[in-house]
Interface confidence: medium
């Protein structure tokens, strides 16, 4: 469970306008539990197919987890008067497969959004920015939790999932104030090149349990506030000099690298040298080689340059296609 949110039909302003009355400040939607004292509304595991229209105006924490929302339309949480207090919205595990542009518009205080565990076949580029302008009004979001939002293979669009998520993160430069971004367990093969440049306020970035093979084209240079970078459980083979220098240059960062299949050949020499002197990597004594076979389970910190060789290229007569 986490903080949650409220939404409406695809004609959000009509809901309360129909009766020409704003919702009563203390009413509680059917199938929900409400606490005005805690400013919390919970509509959890109720198989809701849309966001209740009659959410109380006091709601600060809204939980809509474990439902069957399917689509979050534009203005899903827009109300008249607006839900001005809503700060934390949790939509995790609600079978969302489509989040449309402007879905979170008219939520001026929304600081935390959790869309985890939804198989998002479509995430609009304007889901968080709310408009297709090249520079949008800043989003109030500070924490964005997008763990395990990758759809099953048969539901994927033709475009790359990484690209779709990246487009939503950078659109309109709306997320310049984002402090925390969790993108764990999304089968990411790569991190699109310009994403991090558009998120300069990031303090916590979780990319664990993906399939990242390389960080060669990723720049961390402008993430001067970054405090924690989680890269555990990926497919990283080596970190090259450019990446090492950028990480070392970040004043507050802690990097987590456990459980990657490090390849301990001649290309690993710079990383091993760096590991021995850096204070940036947490638990660096636990990092071990996965390849080549002769190096398996060797501790990276215990290696020296003599251990890190590359097999010479086979002569043409011995090469196989």
């Amino acid at each position: 469970t986490s903080s949650a949110s409220s939404s409406s039909s695809s004609a959000p302003f009509l809901a309360s306008a129909a009766s020409a009355q704003p919702p009563l400040p203390d009413q509680c939607p059917a199938l929900c539990e409400c606490s005005e004292a805690a400013r919390t509304v919970k509509c959890v595991n109720r198989n809701l197919t849309e966001v209740p229209t009659d959410l109380p105006l006091y709601v600060r924490n809204l939980f809509l987890t474990g439902n069957q929302l399917a689509v979050l339309p534009a203005g899903a949480f827009a109300r008249r008067p607006p839900l001005a207090e809503l700060a934390a919205l949790n939509l995790s595990g609600s079978r969302l497969d489509e989040v449309r542009g402007g879905a979170f518009e008219h939520l001026p205080s929304l600081r935390q959004l959790d869309l985890s565990h939804n198989p998002l076949a479509y995430l609009s580029p304007f889901a968080f920015s709310g408009s297709n302008a090249s520079i949008s009004a800043p989003s109030p979001l500070v924490e964005l939790i997008l763990n395990h939002i990758v759809p099953p293979d048969d539901k994927r669009q033709n475009r790359s999932f990484e690209g779709m998520v990246a487009a939503a993160l950078v659109a309109g430069r709306a997320l310049q104030g984002l402090h925390l971004l969790e993108l764990a367990s999304n089968h990411f093969l790569y991190l699109p090149r310009d994403v991090l440049a558009q998120l300069p306020s990031l303090r916590y970035l979780d990319l664990s349990n993906n399939s990242l093979v390389s960080l060669t084209y990723v720049s961390f240079r402008n993430l001067t506030h970054l405090e924690s970078l989680h890269l555990e459980d990926n497919a990283l083979k080596v970190l090259h000099n450019g990446t090492l220098a950028e990480l070392q240059g970040l004043p507050h960062v802690r990097v987590f690298l456990d459980n990657n299949p490090w390849v301990c050949d001649c290309h690993m020499a710079d990383m091993v040298t760096w590991l021995k002197q850096t204070g940036v990597v947490q638990g660096k004594d636990r990092l071990t080689c996965a390849f080549p076979e002769k190096m398996r389970n060797r501790v990276l910190l215990e290696l020296n340059s003599a251990d890190l060789d590359c097999d010479p290229i086979l002569p043409p007569s011995l090469q196989t296609s």
Partner: antibody, heavy 121, light 107 residues
Framework: EVQLLESGGGLVQPGGSLRLSCAAS????????MSWVRQAPGKGLEWVSA????????YYADSVKGRFTISRDNSKNTLYLQMNSLRAEDTAVYYC??????????????WGQGTLVTVSS | DIQMTQSPSSLSASVGDRVTITCRAS??????LNWYQQKPGKAPKLLIY???SLQSGVPSRFSGSGSGTDFTLTISSLQPEDSATYYC?????????FGQGTKLEIK
């Protein structure tokens, strides 16, 4: 309904070993990080160890590092804690707990009932 | 490691009282703090997560606040069933440490 059921506790001599198990049901086990927390008699809670959903990443309190090993079998929906070189100060009730959330937005939302480990000669 | 210090270590209050327990971190932990309640012989129970979010099923008389290093758990109107030990826990650090606990007794 989420359920966590610990087993494997008992009396063991100093220097001995014990393996605790935690059988999970009612949720998709592999999607959640899990943890062990212990409580010595009359004392407070002490975080012992945690493991990621895949089992690939493990974390240990300094007091148990090198002696305890956390692991999981996602096909059996079971969490384990292998405890070696046990000491008198490891005597405690050991709880398994489920983590909800990410690395930071993380909290233990379900706990088992605990299993008592007594280390004594 | 990040140290968590709770105060007071114990307190006694009457039914209907407003009770406040504080938790201080040895370094900034943003809002990554949880509160648990434990009754004798029972497993801990999650009350508040992420500093201020109330866990499902927890009475609304419980609330949490704070950010950075200083956090507060408040019980707005103490009930007899609130007699228990309360623990804070940080999840910012690599190791998710608990405070030493605050034992709350009903007068």
């Amino acid at each position: 309904e989420v359920q966590l059921l610990e087993s494997g506790g008992g009396l063991v001599q100093p220097g001995g070993s014990l393996r605790l198990s935690c059988a999970a049901s009612g949720f998709t086990f592999s999607s959640y990080a899990m943890s062990w927390v212990r409580q010595a008699p009359g004392k407070g809670l002490e975080w012992v160890s945690a493991i990621s959903g895949s089992g690939g990443s493990t974390y240990y309190a300094d007091s148990v590092k090198g002696r305890f090993t956390i692991s999981r079998d996602n096909s059996k929906n079971t969490l384990y804690l292998q405890m070696n070189s046990l000491r008198a100060e490891d005597t405690a009730v050991y709880y398994c707990a489920r983590y909800y959330g990410g690395y930071y937005s993380a909290w233990m939302d379900y706990w088992g009932q605990g299993t008592l480990v007594t280390v004594s000669s | 490691d990040i140290q968590m210090t709770q105060s007071p270590s114990s307190l006694s209050a009457s039914v209907g009282d407003r009770v406040t327990i504080t938790c201080r971190a040895s370094q900034s932990i943003s809002s990554f703090l949880n509160w648990y309640q434990q009754k004798p012989g029972k497993a801990p129970k999650l009350l508040i997560y992420a500093a201020s979010s109330l866990q499902s099923g927890v009475p609304s008389r419980f609330s949490g606040s704070g950010s950075g290093t200083d956090f507060t758990l408040t019980i707005s109107s103490l009930q007899p069933e609130d007699s228990a030990t309360y623990y804070c826990q940080q999840t910012y650090g690599y190791l998710h440490t608990f405070g030493q606990g605050t034992k709350l007794e009903i007068k």
